[in-house]
Amino acid sequence: SGVFQLQLQEFINERGVLASGRPCEPGCRTFFRVCLKHFQAVVSPGPCTFGTVSTPVLGTNSFAVRDDSSGGGRNPLQLPFNFTWPGTFSLIIEAWHAPGDDLRPEALPPDALISKIAIQGSLAVGQNWLLDEQTSTLTRLRYSYRVICSDNYYGDNCSRLCKKRNDHFGHYVCQPDGNLSCLPGWTGEYCQQPICLSGCHEQNGYCSKPAECLCRPGWQGRLCNECIPHNGCRHGTCSTPWQCTCDEGWGGLFCDQDLNYCTHHSPCKNGATCSNSGQRSYTCTCRPGYTGVDCELELSECDSNPCRNGGSCKDQEDGYHCLCPPGYYGLHCEHSTLSCADSPCFNGGSCRERNQGANYACECPPNFTGSNCEKKVDRCTSNPCANGGQCLNRGPSRMCRCRPGFTGTYCELHVSDCARNPCAHGGTCHDLENGLMCTCPAGFSGRRCEVRTSIDACASSPCFNRATCYTDLSTDTFVCNCPYGFVGSRCEFPVGLPPSFPW
């Protein structure tokens, strides 16, 4: 759709005569009829297929025609068309004399024609005004013409409809060729798609208006590139939503079970070495001079009874000192000045000469020890109890009090926690160094498989259109992460363009 515009500029009829050569009385009151039609190889009479227009009387004999376009007048003349502009045309302009006020063709005598021109033209849309002049023996007509597109029509032949808009159906203005030019922040064929915040994750984020970044279920952060871990996840992370991948040293469904008590709590004191031995379980290896489960107790250096032959031990800042009984000397009273003749063996010990009587050795009865059988045997001195068991002296014998999970005379036997079938609902039991672990069948959880949970909600593949399914273990439900172009709780609805565009 467009308009052929014809600007009449000047008409010269100096002698004021008609085409027949007869003069006008009193002068030629001139008006024009214009016929626009399809291009003809030979211009020939026939219908004005592109339209006609007439002017009022514009002047007498010779005159210039005023440009009336600004005042809403009729110059340039407008010949609208509502088809694709073909680029070529035939144009006929007739100048007529109006003896009276009635300018209708049937009201004029046939010899009222002053002059007539007929041309074949070629004209592109939007071209500048094309100036032409037609001269005959008696008259001259100067005129120009051009073709412009109607509002909202564009392109080389005014065939492209484009109406700027900024609403649900599009956000664009129109280029000279009729192509859409999206407003800032919009993209797509009809500029309906907002351009999300720069960096917004393509799959995990979306937007309904420009520079926005809304996260799909299971994602968070300014750019929706951080997954949301499982509800209740304590010491874990995720790479896809609702995961709980435990940090080093943590275990369990929610990563809340401490597998590295040593690092997290540093229970061993006084420079002792800590070894993890199971969930919340550890063993401290004490440095010399310390004892206790956590090596928290400082040992007196005399506790190890270093003085022999009945010597008494005295603690000192830098160690200890042995006070020897008569007949003995040395750091630990280990050297004797006695012989068997001095009856040095106590508690029924028998004396044996050594080194030709220069020395002796006592053979002690049971429950007594020492170079002179002077000490009652402390059967706990050698730490015979394994696995952290506590040694107790019981008269002539000793006894080990074992830590939980261990048994045997010396706590050397590991009690099988699985023996009493502690795992419920068919859970599989695994003995650990200090305790047990249950591997639960689907649908059960908890330390002993005692908690009934839902079967994986994603197992039934409830999501459509290649959406990703995530199980939300906190609510026993699934969440579908839709690919671009689909919506709905199961991604079952395609997002279609509107069926028509109201412009």
Partner: antibody, heavy 118, light 107 residues
């Protein structure tokens, strides 16, 4: 008196060139589209080329496209036909004509003979 | 291209006869058709244009009719000077195309 007088015809070898002219008088040459029309010996009339009144539009028959060029000089009221790469089948009497039936205009020249032969 | 089929190709008639020549176009030419008379050594002479309009100075015994694709030239009463070749020309689209001609001879 309206007159269209063609000139420039003659004998030319195949592949050769000729330039025909058509001098107009007795009417306003610049107002009308002009045509070249030919008639081969013993044959019917055949349109060759067209040029609009201002020279902005030209058309040619397929068999001469790229070989013939129509042009005009309105200041001299003269029409031209430059013929290159001539062939034996171009042999004919060439007429220039001013045709505008809307205005009742139909002027023909007497023609000039072009013979293409080796 | 628009083909113009003219008939008959030749015709014998006597002075005073009524003669009809036809031209058929291969597509609609919207009445953009002219009839010419051609005598040997002379330029063609326009008789009828726009299918039915008589050119100034042409005797009224010549008339034209038709529309769409079928057109007719009628000479109501042949005169001795009318013996010549007649042809049609379509001016609707390029290339311009002529009928093959009808040679009108004295019987």
């Amino acid at each position: 008196e309206v007159q269209l007088v063609e000139s420039g015809g003659g004998l030319v070898q195949p592949g050769g060139s000729l330039r025909l002219s058509c001098a107009a008088s007795g009417f306003t040459f610049s107002n009308y589209g002009m045509y070249w029309i030919r008639q081969a010996p013993g044959k019917g009339l055949e349109w060759v080329a067209f040029i609009s009144h201002g020279g902005g539009i030209t058309y040619y028959r397929d068999s001469v496209k790229g070989r013939f060029t129509i042009s005009r000089d309105n200041s001299k009221s003269t029409l031209y036909l430059q013929m290159n790469s001539l062939r034996a089948e171009d042999t004919a009497v060439y007429h220039c004509a001013a045709l505008n039936w809307e205005l009742g205009i139909d002027y023909w020249g007497q023609g000039t003979m072009v013979t293409v032969s080796s | 291209d628009i083909q113009m089929t003219q008939s008959p190709s030749s015709l014998s008639a006597s002075v005073g006869d009524r003669v009809t020549i036809t031209c058929r176009a291969s597509e609609d030419i919207y009445s953009n058709l002219a009839w010419y008379q051609k005598k040997p050594g002379k330029s063609p002479k326009l008789l009828i244009y726009a299918a039915n309009r008589l050119q100034d100075g042409v005797p009224s015994r010549f008339s034209g009719s038709g529309s769409g694709t079928d057109y007719t030239l009628t000479i109501s009463s042949l005169q001795p000077e009318d013996f010549a070749t007649y042809f049609c020309l379509q001016g609707s689209k390029f290339p311009l195309t002529f009928g093959q001609g009808t040679k009108l001879e004295i019987k």
